[in-house]
Every structure is written in structure tokens, then in C-alpha cells.
């Protein structure tokens, strides 16, 4: 069966900046800003776009050792990210996968709202365990607040322009943004 869940949470960080940090560079940021939640993120295959497989490892003491995520969609225009948990963690005899969608929407006060939808695909007639949904939400909240704190403490991060050389680009010297840098290196 399929079970849908939805949560909304707010952030003081503007949508574009939060998308860059939390979504596009989460692989690098999470182990740095929340080592108690995530120990490492490893790219197994792909370049960050749809089809990319990532292995997220958790520190000792947490219930699961790792999960593997598959990237389904990265929408840079609408700040939307779709991915699925396809292996490890809770995936097993009763749970086939968890599909997730994160949308970051700008708010008039300069902050943002994160709309998070989770779709649990269970095997047969199995139900979804409430504590598992709760743990997943708590993990997401932990990561978000850690990234938020980092961004508040580092006002230049993920919003400044950088001068990069022609060796980096394989072309002429250009002034490009963090987002362009991410596209260049990861897509």
C-alpha cells in the first residue's frame, strides 16, 4: 500500500539560499554541521541529477547504519527536490521505499516555508509505524536547524559571488554564483 504524510516547517533563511545549502550542498554540509545525525554522504553513482544514488551513513548509536537515496528530480527554478529512500534503514520486509518531495517556498518576510511530503510504499497490507514517521521528521528537523544555524553564523556562505579561473571552467574567466559552481562541479 501507499501512505502519504505531509509536514510544513519554517525557516528564517531565504528560499534560494536555503535551497543551495540544504538541498544542493547537503552532502557536504550535513556531516559538517550535524555530525551527531549524519557521519558521511557518499555518491555511489551519478552526477547529482536524476538517477544519482547516494549512501548516507549514520553515526554509531543511531538505530540504522545507513540508507541509500535515489535522486528523482532537482528543480532549481521552483526550489523542489524529489528523492527516494531505496535501501538500508527502515527499508526491508515490510517497507519497499519512501518517496519524498521537498519544496522551499519564499515568504514575504524574507524567510521560507519547507513543504515536505513523504510517501511510504509498504509491502502487501503492512501499515507504517508511527514511530518511524516521527523519527524521520525529527531527523529532517535536526538537519534543517543545523544548516540554518550554520548559515546564520556564516553570512557569506551560499550567497556570494566567486571569481573562478579558466582552468576550473575550461574557458574564459567568469564571475559566477555558488549555484553555477555547484552545477559545474556536480551536474
Amino acid at each position: 500500500g501507499v501512505f502519504n504524510y505531509e509536514t510544513e516547517t519554517t525557516s528564517v533563511i531565504p528560499a534560494a539560499r536555503l535551497f543551495k545549502a540544504f538541498i544542493l550542498d547537503g552532502d557536504n554540509l550535513f556531516p559538517k554541521v550535524a555530525p551527531q545525525a549524519i557521519s558521511s554522504v557518499e555518491n555511489i553513482e551519478g552526477n547529482g541529477g536524476p538517477g544519482t544514488i547516494k549512501k548516507i551513513s549514520f553515526p554509531e548509536g543511531l538505530p540504522f547504519k545507513y540508507v541509500k537515496d535515489r535522486v528523482d528530480e532537482v528543480d532549481h527554478t521552483n526550489f523542489k527536490y524529489n528523492y527516494a529512500v531505496i535501501e538500508g534503514g527502515p527499508i526491508g520486509d515490510t517497507l519497499e521505499k519512501i518517496s519524498n518531495e521537498i519544496k522551499i517556498v519564499a515568504t514575504p518576510d524574507g524567510g521560507s516555508i519547507l513543504k515536505i511530503s513523504n510517501k511510504y510504499h509498504t509491502k502487501g497490507d503492512h501499515e507504517v509505524k508511527a514511530e518511524q514517521v516521527k523519527a524521520s521528521k525529527e531527523m529532517g528537523e535536526t538537519l534543517l536547524r543545523a544548516v540554518e544555524s550554520y548559515l546564520l553564523a556564516h553570512s557569506d556562505a551560499y550567497n556570494e559571488q566567486k571569481l573562478i579561473s579558466e582552468e576550473d571552467l575550461g574557458g574564459e574567466q567568469k564571475l559566477i554564483s555558488e549555484e553555477d559552481l555547484h552545477h559545474h562541479h556536480h551536474h
Epitope: G1, V2, F3, N4, Y5, E6, T7, D72, E73, N82, A84, E96, K97, S99, E101, S117, K119, H121
Partner: antibody, heavy 119, light 108 residues
Framework: EVQLVESGGGLVQPGGSLRLSCAAS????????MHWVRQAPGEGLEWVAA????????DYADSVKGRFTISRDNAKNSLYLQMNSLKTEDTALYYC????????????WGQGTLVTVSS | EIVLTQSPGTLSLSPGERASLSCRAS???????LAWYQQKPGQAPRLLIY???SRFIGIPDRFSGGGSGTDFTLTITRLEPEDFAVYYC?????????FGQGTKVEIK
């Protein structure tokens, strides 16, 4: 403008088979889950089956499980419903419906194709 | 599965009047996963409301949705001639996705 056009309906005997098609246009088909919903003559709506973006997850109503198969061809912007072992109670207008993207409400519908199962 | 029961089965009203349609779920519909559709004779259903109370694009503001848990309502504040139709509620919190049996709003 989103357009969904169903075809393949017709008269079939109990135990027979039919394959319905739905041609989609006006949106990026591969980015959306798709569904079949049916409506028996003079009756209400009944969800039949769902297929997610890249066909890696499929779900069926208990009433059709094991008899119907939903599939899609993202290259052809097409959705299909293979119906086997048809019963008289499968007689209905079959609608192809587009999901809003991630959750399961239907923001666009085709006009339907009529399947009549009768001897 | 979640069973949705709509009432009344038929509502006879005049244009300009207010219509209140009820949809009751056999168990709680999580996270407001409830939609309303309108269907006219010979036509496909049309999405009106999703997420209990969010109007779909192009839907007039005389249509509004409300409720939570197991009890939901669709309200049409001033009935226009084109509003006479059958209305269905649908839950999408868990599969199988289910519809109510419909409420027919007819001209008195």
C-alpha cells in the same frame, strides 16, 4: 493545456481482455504519477490503479488486483491499462487521470473510454 | 480502506442559495489529504478543492472546503446555474484512494 485522450474501450465477453490507452500532452508526462479511475453507469467514482513517475511503484484496487496491469511509456507520453479476465462488474467508463505530481489527487481527467463486459 | 460517506444524497436548492455538503470518513484522514470534485452529466470530473480547503486554479471563491479528522464540508455560498452537478469527496492519505458516493445538487 493538459490533454488526456483515452482509447481502446469496447464490448467484450466475460473472461475476455482489453487494453486501454491514454495519450497525454501539454505537460511533462514523465514527471507525474498517473491513474485509472472508473465509473460504472449511473454510479460513483472508483480508483483502479496508479503508476508513479518511473514505473518503479504501482498500486491497484483490490477489485482488480491480479487481473489488471497498469503501465506507461514515458517516451511516447502514454499510459496503458491491460485488463484480463474481465467480469460484468468491470463495465464502466474508464478515465485516465493526471496526478498533481506527488500526492494522489487528480488535477486533470480525460473524457473516458467505455468498457462493456457482457455476453 | 477508508470509507467516505457523503450526505445528503440529493440537495434541492434554488440559484443564489447556500449549499453545504458533508463528507464523513470511517477513520481519520491524515494531514488533510481530502479533495472535492464536481461532475456534470456527460463530463469528466473536475478538481475543485484539495488539501481540505485549497481551491484549485480557476475555481471561483464561492467554493470553500473545511473540516478535519473525519468530518469535512464543501460549501457553495451562492449557487450559480452552472453549479448544479454531482460532487464527490476523495481521500488520498492512504491507498486505496477512495471516493464518497456523491451528492447531487439539483435545481429546486
Amino acid at each position: 493545456e493538459v490533454q488526456l485522450v483515452e482509447s481502446g474501450g469496447g464490448l467484450v465477453q466475460p473472461g475476455g481482455s482489453l487494453r486501454l490507452s491514454c495519450a497525454a500532452s501539454g505537460f511533462t508526462f514523465r514527471n507525474y504519477a498517473m491513474h485509472w479511475v472508473r465509473q460504472a453507469p449511473g454510479e460513483g467514482l472508483e480508483w483502479v490503479a496508479a503508476i508513479y513517475r518511473n514505473s518503479d511503484s504501482i498500486d491497484y484496487a483490490d477489485s482488480v488486483k491480479g487481473r489488471f496491469t497498469i503501465s506507461r511509456d514515458n517516451a511516447k507520453n502514454s499510459l496503458y491499462l491491460q485488463m484480463n479476465s474481465l467480469k460484468t462488474e468491470d463495465t464502466a467508463l474508464y478515465y485516465c487521470a493526471k496526478d498533481e505530481g506527488f500526492l494522489e489527487y487528480f488535477d486533470s481527467w480525460g473524457q473516458g473510454t467505455l468498457v462493456t463486459v457482457s455476453s | 480502506e477508508i470509507v467516505l460517506t457523503q450526505s445528503p444524497g440529493t440537495l434541492s436548492l434554488s440559484p443564489g442559495e447556500r449549499a453545504s455538503l458533508s463528507c464523513r470518513a470511517s477513520q481519520s484522514v491524515s494531514s488533510s489529504f481530502l479533495a472535492w470534485y464536481q461532475q456534470k452529466p456527460g463530463q469528466a470530473p473536475r478538481l475543485l478543492i484539495y488539501g481540505v480547503s485549497s481551491r484549485f486554479i480557476g475555481i471561483p471563491d464561492r467554493f470553500s472546503g473545511g473540516g478535519s479528522g473525519t468530518d469535512f464540508t464543501l460549501t457553495i455560498t451562492r449557487l450559480e446555474p452552472e453549479d448544479f452537478a454531482v460532487y464527490y469527496c476523495q481521500q488520498y492519505g492512504r491507498s486505496p484512494w477512495t471516493f464518497g458516493q456523491g451528492t447531487k445538487v439539483e435545481i429546486k
